[in-house]
């Protein structure tokens, strides 16, 4: 597994850097998630043919997979930094039971989709010290991920490959849209 | 990295229009957020537009919203901006460079490969 951003050798290197910003330290960890889910999706597509799957056909599912729409202030159109804070922080959250469901989907990888996991919860606490008004984020229902979580792992395996997939575009897009927006704040 | 080649640029009037290419043989250019940036003579480097590995992601400077479209063709490894309403303050060498994590910024550090420009010239 790849080490955690601040741990890499440069900065061990590099002892009398100025220390990361908090919107530093947040963009770099995004890419080192970034750089795990191209690592989990590079073993997903070598073992099923999902990617080279449309996205039309894929968008048939019942997945309801957290999506930055115009409403949310994270785009240009729009934009508007508090409203889109909390989308992302609010999307993290929501994408956490599915984090959660890729544990154990991985034979070769099974590391780095724990590393995606638990950066993805530092990243979390990083993005609520920086949110204004945390009153506006709501936090998933644990009865509800638990069930949800339960109808995943039930599923045949080619739905569950096809889940896997889902799944890691999906939250690859959402960061991408996140960091964009996040480096105009 | 991938090699990145500018065209499209030349002298226009103002008022006219050019569409700019950045080109790359890589073959996971559509993977890579592209940005446009300019340099006119004795200033920095600025930034123009960008688009993201999701096509819809574009942001653009607020000198060139409403005039200058950025789009992308997968297929032809290429992405475009489109320059119309061109204005003498407009000239200047464009340069594109492409991010690999597909987020794009208007900031040059977020790039990490950079073509070698095109120069855009508006004049009567």
């Known amino acids: 597994a790849p080490v955690p951003p601040g741990e890499d050798s440069k900065d061990v290197a590099a002892p009398h850097r100025q220390p990361l910003t908090s919107s530093e330290r947040i963009d770099k960890q995004i890419r080192y998630i970034l750089d795990g889910i191209s690592a989990l999706r590079k073993e997903t597509c070598n073992k099923s043919n999902m990617c080279e799957s449309s996205k039309e056909a894929l968008a048939e599912n019942n997945l309801n997979l957290p999506k930055m729409a115009e409403k949310d202030g994270c785009f240009q159109s729009g934009f508007n930094e508090e409203t889109c804070l909390v989308k992302i922080i609010t999307g993290l959250l929501e994408f956490e039971v599915y984090l959660e469901y890729l544990q154990n989907r991985f034979e070769s990888s099974e590391e780095q989709a724990r590393a995606v996991q638990m950066s993805t919860k530092v990243l979390i606490q990083f993005l609520q010290k920086k949110a204004k008004n945390l009153d506006a984020i709501t936090t998933p229902d644990p009865t509800t991920n638990a069930s949800l979580l339960t109808k995943l792992q039930a599923q045949n395996q080619w739905l569950q490959d096809m889940t896997t997939h889902l799944i890691l575009r999906s939250f690859k897009e959402f960061l991408q849209s996140s960091l964009r927006a996040l480096r105009q704040m | 990295e991938v090699q990145l080649v500018e065209s499209g640029g030349g002298l226009v009037q103002p008022g006219g229009s050019l569409k700019l290419s950045c080109t790359t043989s890589?073959?996971?250019?559509?993977?890579?957020?592209v940005g446009w940036f300019r340099q006119a003579p004795g200033k920095e480097r600025e930034f123009v537009a960008d688009i993201g590995e999701q096509a819809e992601n574009t942001w653009y400077a607020e000198s060139v919203l409403g005039r200058f479209t950025i789009s992308r063709d997968d297929a032809k490894n290429t992405v475009y901006l489109e320059m119309d309403g061109l204005k003498p303050e407009d000239t200047a060498v464009y340069y594109c460079a492409a991010d690999k994590y597909g987020v794009g910024g208007n900031a040059q550090g977020y790039y990490d490969s950079w073509g070698q420009g095109t120069q855009v010239t508006v004049s009567s």
């Open positions: 890589g073959r996971r250019f559509s993977s890579y957020a």
